[in-house]
């Protein structure tokens, strides 16, 4: 039988290679049964995940899944880093795996490198 626990579908060690100045939507896919949980995003600072306050977020509904979206309008170099979503469900906190944004500043790159190049060339990235 299907579990009615809240589940957050962010893959472990996932990443997104993006460019400063572009818009980007970071999605947290959420599975729940009856009541949609409260979901928040945080950004990792070492081992601490700092809750993101006052950011533009939204929900998108698909047939079997809801998506809690963090909007970057536009992406800034300082958005580089790892993010995690958390759901508050029946007084318990369910945390997703973290996902990493690799941000390239197009001003410092003569041409846009590929996703794989960005993930493997940390000198292109902001920390």
């Amino acid at each position: 039988k299907e579990s009615c626990d809240v589940q957050l579908y962010i893959k472990r060690q996932s990443y997104h290679s993006i460019f400063a100045g572009d818009p980007f939507k970071l999605e947290c896919p959420v599975k729940y049964c009856a009541h949609r949980p409260q979901v928040t995003w945080c950004k990792l600072n070492g081992t601490t995940c700092v809750k993101l306050e006052g950011r533009h977020t939204s929900w998108k509904q698909e047939k079997n899944l809801s998506f809690f979206i963090l909007h970057f309008e536009p992406v800034l170099p300082s958005d580089n880093g790892s993010y995690r979503c958390s759901a508050n469900f029946l007084s318990a906190i369910i945390e997703s795996h973290s996902t990493t944004l690799y941000v390239t500043d197009v001003k410092s790159a003569s041409e846009r490198p590929s996703k794989d190049e960005m993930a493997s060339r940390p000198w292109l990235l902001y920390s």
Epitope: L8, S14, H16, S17, S98
Partner: antibody, heavy 119, light 112 residues
């Protein structure tokens, strides 16, 4: 029934290229990471790299970077390993494996395909 | 890269007896999410590997409960409490905490 079936192996000359396929069924490939491993005759296992079929992102062991390309077609549930500039030491059984990406719920391996690099 | 070292390289154990295989990593495998991504694979002669244990101690579905995994940080153990004939295989530990993922050299388990 869950299946991963590798194909495309065989005898290939040094310096040539080869594309291996991994046809999957019985699960949603986009919920997983597809890994490629290899095992030289009588030796241990070695991780080549992995692909996220949901977005195409890849990671490789350094020694394969630039010589191996892992890709996947999520709509067909097939993954690929392209190997270029093959050397005799690339002779091995190549395995694909699919590991669930969210909660480690499964890790399925294919039966492997033998690649022999020889002139 | 993380170096994974298994001991012993080979092991002969009588049927019904306990078999213990050790695996040591050159760095802690504790991830920042608090989990340890250490796996054990079983490869029977002429077959492809099969996932046996993941997250140090979780048994894959269908794996008999005579198999168990333990350990933390850098030191891990696979134990077969009562060896059966079908357990004849090579066992590998591998880590997927740190890139690149790496394997132990394997331990060949034979029946005494």
């Amino acid at each position: 029934e869950v299946q991963l079936v590798e194909s495309g192996g065989g005898l290939v000359q040094p310096g040539r290229s080869l594309r291996l396929s991994c046809t999957t069924s019985g699960f949603n490939i986009k919920d997983t990471y597809i890994h490629w491993f290899r095992q030289a005759p009588g030796k241990g296992l070695e991780w080549v790299g992995r692909n996220d079929p949901a977005n195409g992102n890849t990671k490789y062991t350094a020694s394969f970077k630039g010589r191996a390309t892992i890709s996947a077609d999520g709509s067909k549930s097939i993954a690929y390993l392209q190997m270029n500039s093959l050397k005799t030491e690339d002779t091995a059984v190549y395995y694909c494996a699919s590991y669930e990406g969210y909660y480690e719920r499964f890790g399925y391996w294919g039966q492997g395909t033998l690649v022999t690099v020889s002139s | 890269d993380i170096v994974m070292t298994q001991s012993p390289d080979s092991l002969a154990v009588s049927l019904g007896e306990r078999a213990t295989i050790n695996c040591k990593s050159s760095q802690s495998l504790l991830d920042r999410d608090g989990k340890t991504y250490l796996n054990w694979l079983q490869q029977k002669p002429g077959q492809s590997p099969k996932r046996l244990i993941y997250l140090v101690s979780k048994l894959d579905s269908g794996v008999p409960d005579r198999f168990s995994g333990s350990g933390s940080g850098t030191d891990f153990t696979l134990t077969i409490s009562s060896l059966q004939a079908e357990d004849l295989a090579v066992y590998y530990c591998w880590q997927d905490t740190h890139f690149p993922y790496t394997f132990g050299q394997g331990t060949k388990l034979e029946i005494k």
